[in-house]
């Protein structure tokens, strides 16, 4: 059964950064190097996280708090507390099982991580393409001709030399 921590449990007096050392009449001993306790009353200290391989140390382990890791250049964190490091790709690419691949025509990725996403379909909002999309950038939608009052100056996009939205690969 779980006892309420009280006078009957002398270990409850051991603060964070220590453990209750039963081998030494339940006195509070400091956590040994490479370990920590973030709460009081612990019978053992926790093993510090080690930032190795593609992980690098962002914050050293202390007696009361765990180490924090981030990723070496060319990688980015994934998951809670940077539990994984994933390879960066260039803008205009996405990471697949076979490595970094260029975004397919009609999709883009403006970051070094994540997946390629489809260009915005301007016509769904009744708008026209103002700036063509590329692998790295989404299209920019402009007002539809009907939105322009007579005599208003219209921004005329440069005549596409290729099919709309396409850019040199």
């Amino acid at each position: 059964f779980e006892r309420t921590r009280s006078l009957q449990d002398p270990c409850s007096n051991c603060p964070a950064g220590t453990f209750c050392d039963n081998n030494r009449n339940q006195i509070c001993s400091p956590c040994p190097p490479n370990s920590f306790s973030s709460a009081g009353g612990q019978r053992t200290c926790d093993i510090c996280r080690q930032c190795k391989g593609v992980f690098r140390t962002r914050k050293e382990c202390s007696s009361t708090s765990n180490a924090e890791c981030d990723c070496t250049p060319g990688f980015h964190c994934l998951g809670a507390g940077c539990s994984m490091c994933e390879q960066d790709c260039k803008q205009g690419q996405e990471l697949t099982k076979k490595g970094c691949k260029d975004c397919c025509f009609g999709t883009f990725n403006d970051q070094k991580r994540g997946i390629c996403r489809p260009w915005t379909n301007c016509s769904l909002d009744g708008k026209s393409v103002l700036v063509n999309g590329t692998k790295e950038r989404d299209v920019v939608c402009g007002p539809s001709p009907a939105d322009l009052s007579p005599g208003a100056s219209s921004v005329t996009p440069p005549a596409p030399a290729r099919e709309p939205g396409h850019s040199p690969q």
Epitope: F1, E2, R3, R5, D9, C11, F19, C20, D21, N22, N23, S29, C31, P32, P33, N34, S35, S38, A39, G41, Q42, R43, T44, C45, D46, I47, Q50, N66
Partner: antibody, heavy 120, light 111 residues
Framework: EVQLVQSGAEVKKPGSSVKVSCKAS????????LNWVRQAPGQGLEWMGY????????KYNEKFEGRVTITADKSTSTAYMELSSLRSEDTAVYYC?????????????WGQGTLVTVSS | DIVMTQSPDSLAVSLGERATINCRAS??????????MHWYQQKPGQPPKLLIY???NLESGVPDRFSGSGSGTDFTLTISSLQAEDVAVYYC?????????FGQGTKLEIK
């Protein structure tokens, strides 16, 4: 008496997940880390990771990172180990084991073990 | 990872005789004045049982015919006078470095 009582045997299909429980009694559940160690048939012992039920802190063997999740329910003094994407090589007896005293990081109290069989 | 290698893989000893099991770590398991090496006994159909902690300390309730010695990378578990109930598999374990690792086990039988 300090005791760890585990859930019963499981038979699972490849690709599925299994969740094994470990109910602790006879000590202050939140004061000691609870580990999971597995043993394939006729093989040695392999540490999978542990949880500090007081803080919720977990530490996993990198070999299992991403496939194993260890949790604890303080209200019932029960720890759980979930292993996903099971394959035939995961057929083993899974033990929960409590840390010993102090700074030793050894396994002083063991559950009776749970046999997990992965077979199509 | 620290690799633990036990020798021999199996051992047959007469009742009342001394049994010696060795364990070698691929790197030192000494740290800050402590030796993070432990020994376990496992009988068929049962979970392991802690015998020796930190190389040479006898766990409570374990008969004093069991003893442990060593430091750094080389360790020994000794049973001074083998009893029938000592037939089991014995494992060493290091806790100096994450991940915690075990030896492959040594099977002890009666000759």
């Amino acid at each position: 008496e300090v005791q760890l009582v585990q859930s019963g045997a499981e038979v699972k299909k490849p690709g599925s997940s299994v969740k094994v429980s470990c109910k602790a009694s006879g000590y202050t559940f939140t004061s000691y880390g609870l580990n999971w160690v597995r043993q394939a048939p006729g093989q040695g012992l392999e540490w999978m990771g542990y949880i500090n039920p007081g803080s919720g802190y977990t530490k996993y063997n990198e070999k299992f990172e991403g496939r194993v999740t260890i949790t604890a329910d303080k209200s019932t003094s029960t720890a759980y180990m979930e292993l996903s994407s099971l394959r035939s090589e995961d057929t083993a007896v899974y033990y929960c084991a409590r840390w010993g005293l102090g700074r030793n990081w050894n396994f002083a109290v063991w559950g009776q073990g749970t046999l997990v069989t992965v077979s199509s | 990872d620290i690799v633990m290698t036990q020798s021999p893989d199996s051992l047959a000893v007469s009742l009342g005789e001394r049994a010696t099991i060795n364990c070698r770590a691929s790197e030192s398991v000494d740290s800050y004045g402590n030796t993070f090496m432990h020994w376990y006994q496992q009988k068929p159909g049962q979970p392991p049982k802690l015998l020796i902690y930190r190389a040479s300390n006898l766990e409570s309730g374990v008969p004093d015919r069991f003893s442990g010695s060593g430091s750094g990378t080389d360790f020994t578990l000794t049973i001074s006078s083998l009893q029938a109930e000592d037939v089991a598999v014995y494992y060493c374990q290091q806790s100096n470095e994450d991940p915690l690792t075990f030896g492959q086990g040594t099977k002890l039988e009666i000759k």
